[in-house]
Structures are given as structure tokens and as C-alpha cells.
């Protein structure tokens, strides 16, 4: 699986999850988030050669098409597969609000 | 929606579905497929600027991060959203077999 366990331990050039730390205040301008100050959002990148973690029949077909037609611009792309939520704390007035934001952290990637 | 209705009618540079005809025999080497000879598989391509059909909170965050940090290499990618099946005819011995292959045709795209 192209997940953090594999990708963070290996020097993998092809599609894999990469570490990316985002600081809410500096990187997004979200000054209202009290905790955490930032988090590892991660991202997916790297080429998708034929059959690499192909997501659908279409991505398999496209990968094969690309292999047999190297000049073609139509190739699968490395995108998030499994995402996890992130819990944040912020204030509404004086009331602390704890909220779970869905799909914030990339745990694995796929070729789609 | 970044679907065939919109994308095939507009000269859209950003993420959109593009027409791609695949000939089973010539492009894939699938000589066993009797009918059809080929089909419009289509594919997704084009940049994913900030907020273009963002798929998840992560792609929204990544798009925003990329906008505020233009030198960053972490950006969402244009990939299939809605896919449709394709019915093919092939022979097993002299017996014709009709089969529906799932997720063969891209109908719309998203930034993921």
C-alpha cells in the first residue's frame, strides 16, 4: 500500500504520500484555530507507471495506453486514497469549541 | 460540474474531462475484444487552481496552501469523478460472451 508506513520509510520516486506540515496561521491565514498550531496534512505526488496502485479499470486502461503510447499526455495521477480527520479547538465568543474536521490528513495515495 | 456537457463545449484550460478515443487492438493490444473496436475512455487533465471543484477538505486546504505558497509543489490533481461502464463482446472458444466492464468511461473530473 502507498501509505505513510511504506512511503515515509522508502525513497520512492513513483506515486506515494509525502510529508507536508501546514501551520494554520502562517500557511493558511486561519488565525482563529487555537489548537493545534499546525498539523501534517501530507500530499500525494510521483509518476503513475502502468499498474501502480491503479484505482479503477479506467486507470489501468490509461496506464496501459500510456505505456504503449509514450507520447500521450493522458496518464493517471497520484491522489489521496485514505484520509483521516483532525480535531481542532477554537473559540466562539468565550466558548471553546472542539470540532472534528473530516478528510484533513492524507494517509495513503492511489493512481486515479 | 466538470463533466462532458460542459468540458466538451468549452475551451477550458483548467481541470476538465477531455475526449480520448482508445482502439482496443492498436492502443491496448487487446485483440480479444470483438465489439466495440474502440471507445471514448476520455481522461482528466488541466491545472487545479484554488477552489476548482475541490473534492475534500484536504484538497481545499492544499489549494489554499498552494495559493499562499506559490513555490510549493504540493497541489491537487485533476482526476476522474464519475465513471460509467462499457459493454463488450468477446469469444470464449466459439461462444460469444457479453460483459459489462465497470469504470471504463470518464464522465466528469474533480480536483483531489
Amino acid at each position: 500500500a502507498l501509505d505513510t508506513n511504506y512511503c515515509f520509510r522508502n525513497l520512492e520516486e513513483n506515486c506515494c504520500v509525502r510529508p507536508l506540515y501546514i501551520d494554520f496561521r502562517q500557511d493558511l491565514g486561519w488565525k482563529w484555530v487555537h489548537e493545534p498550531k499546525g498539523y501534517y496534512a501530507n500530499f500525494c505526488s510521483g509518476p503513475c507507471p502502468y499498474l501502480r496502485s491503479a484505482d479503477t479499470t479506467h486507470s489501468t486502461v490509461l496506464g496501459l495506453y500510456n505505456t504503449l503510447n509514450p507520447e500521450a499526455s493522458a496518464s493517471p495521477c497520484c491522489v489521496p486514497q485514505d484520509l483521516e480527520p483532525l480535531t481542532i479547538l477554537y473559540y466562539v465568543g468565550r466558548t471553546p469549541k472542539v470540532e472534528q474536521l473530516s478528510n484533513m490528513v492524507v494517509k495513503s495515495c492511489k493512481c486515479s | 460540474a466538470l463533466d462532458t456537457n460542459y468540458c466538451f463545449r468549452n475551451l477550458e484550460e483548467n481541470c476538465c474531462v477531455r475526449p480520448l478515443y482508445i482502439d482496443f487492438r492498436q492502443d491496448l493490444g487487446w485483440k480479444w475484444v470483438h465489439e466495440p473496436k474502440g471507445y471514448y475512455a476520455n481522461f482528466c487533465s488541466g491545472p487545479c487552481p484554488y477552489l476548482r471543484s475541490a473534492d475534500t477538505t484536504h484538497s481545499t486546504v492544499l489549494g489554499l496552501y498552494n495559493t499562499l505558497n506559490p513555490e510549493a509543489s504540493a497541489s491537487p490533481c485533476c482526476v476522474p469523478q464519475d465513471l460509467e461502464p462499457l459493454t463488450i463482446l468477446y469469444y470464449v472458444g466459439r461462444t460469444p460472451k457479453v460483459e459489462q466492464l465497470s469504470n471504463m468511461v470518464v464522465k466528469s473530473c474533480k480536483c483531489s
Epitope: G29, W32, Y91, G93, L101 | T57, T60, L64
Partner: antibody, heavy 119, light 112 residues
Framework: QVQLQQPGAELVKPGASVKMSCKAS????????ITWVKQRPGQGLEWIGD????????NYNEKFKTKASLTVDTSSSTANMQLSSLTSEDSAVYSC????????????WGQGTSVTVSS | DVVMTQTPLSLPVSLGDQASISCRSS???????????LHWYLQKPGQSPKLLIY???NRFSGVPDRFSGSGSGTDFTLKISRVEAEDLGVYFC?????????FGSGTKLEIK
């Protein structure tokens, strides 16, 4: 420049619902909260609630929790507010505005949508 | 709910005069973080409100330095050192320390 565009007026019947829009331009939509305010002549301003386009997070004034529903469409940089079970008490000007966080001051306002509830 | 009481309701002034508007809250507006979330707006006829002062005493960008905000806890004042014709309209105070956020009823600044 920052702009929040709202339709000028809506005429609706009692008991019906109305959905009004607020199209944002000139800034990064997912960096700011959108707040909604009700203004009736001689009654002052009332805070309805806030929504954050970046995550879809919402906060409501308890008074409007069953009356108003806030949503966003990030692809078109548009915030929406739906008001349900309308009565004459809901006749007012509804303005959207933006702010950097729930506790921050509103720095730019829309022109407001005038809602008239009448049979 | 925190009640914001503004006085006077109407303030007739001559151009060039100093004007002072008072706003009193029914509870302290000092947040646990130390900030006082008290803001001032000006609304001209047929227009949407414009931000003048945020967080007690900070002038918003483009606001002339003849406007100043002061106060602490529950008593706040907006001062205009030399009233100009463009300053006429209704002034509102607003608090965002307590939920629900509330507004004053307004003070109409008009020519004597």
C-alpha cells in the same frame, strides 16, 4: 477589491422558505468566515450565525437555529442562507459579511437582501 | 444575551466639532485571552455598514485618524475629533466576546 454580492429583494409567502445567496470576490474565500446579520427598521442588527467555507464549520445564534441554515459552495465562492417557515417577523434586510474568525470584527459587508413575507 | 446600550440615540453636531458616542455592555467584554472584542461601525443611508474600529481601539485600514476608540470592561467611547460631512450616519457598537454576538441600537450623527 473585496465584494459580497447579494440579490436585492425576495418576496415570499408565509410558511414558505427562501434561499438567498452571497457571492464573494476579490479575496481568498476559504480564508475568511462568512457571517449573516438581520436588520429590521427600528429593531437594530441581529447576528444569525457564521460559516467557514474552508471546512464548512458553522456557529448559530440559538434564536435562529431552527430558522436559518447556512451553507457554502466553494467552487463558486458563494455562501447561502435558507430561512424556513417564514412569518411577517422574518421580513427584514439580511446581510452577509466576512471576518477573519468567529470573534473577529466584520470588515466587509454585502448590500443585503430585502425579504418581504406577504400573502 | 449581552445588551449593548448606546447613548445618545441622536447626536446633532456642527462640522468641525468633536463628537463622542458612548456604548455600555451588560457584561465585561474582556476575553480570557485578554482581548476586548468591541467594534464600531458607521452605516450611511442606503449603504451597508463600514468598519471603523476593531478590538476596542484599532483603526481599520483607510479610516482617518480623527476616529478613535477607547474604554475598558463595560464602558466604551468612540470619538471623532473634527466632524466632517462624510461622517454623518448611524454609528453602531458591536461585541464578539460573548455568544450570541450583539449590536448596539445605533447613534445617529446629524448636522445641528
Amino acid at each position: 477589491q473585496v465584494q459580497l454580492q447579494q440579490p436585492g429583494a425576495e418576496l415570499v409567502k408565509p410558511g414558505a422558505s427562501v434561499k438567498m445567496s452571497c457571492k464573494a470576490s476579490g479575496y481568498i474565500f476559504t480564508s475568511y468566515w462568512i457571517t449573516w446579520v438581520k436588520q429590521r427598521p427600528g429593531q437594530g442588527l441581529e447576528w444569525i450565525g457564521d460559516i467557514f467555507p474552508g471546512t464548512g464549520s458553522t456557529n448559530y445564534n440559538e434564536k435562529f437555529k431552527t430558522k436559518a441554515s447556512l451553507t457554502v459552495d466553494t467552487s463558486s465562492s458563494t455562501a447561502n442562507m435558507q430561512l424556513s417557515s417564514l412569518t411577517s417577523e422574518d421580513s427584514a434586510v439580511y446581510s452577509c459579511a466576512r471576518k477573519l474568525g468567529p470573534n473577529y470584527a466584520v470588515d466587509y459587508w454585502g448590500q443585503g437582501t430585502s425579504v418581504t413575507v406577504s400573502s | 444575551d449581552v445588551v449593548m446600550t448606546q447613548t445618545p440615540l441622536s447626536l446633532p453636531v456642527s462640522l468641525g466639532d468633536q463628537a463622542s458616542i458612548s456604548c455600555r455592555s451588560s457584561q465585561s467584554l474582556i476575553h480570557s485571552h485578554g482581548n476586548t472584542y468591541l467594534h464600531w461601525y458607521l452605516q450611511k443611508p442606503g449603504q451597508s455598514p463600514k468598519l471603523l474600529i476593531y478590538k476596542l481601539s484599532n483603526r481599520f485600514s483607510g479610516v482617518p485618524d480623527r476616529f478613535s476608540g477607547s474604554g475598558s470592561g463595560t464602558d466604551f467611547t468612540l470619538k471623532i475629533s473634527r466632524v466632517e460631512a462624510e461622517d454623518l450616519g448611524v454609528y453602531f457598537c458591536s461585541q464578539s466576546t460573548h455568544v450570541p454576538f450583539t449590536f448596539g441600537s445605533g447613534t445617529k450623527l446629524e448636522i445641528k
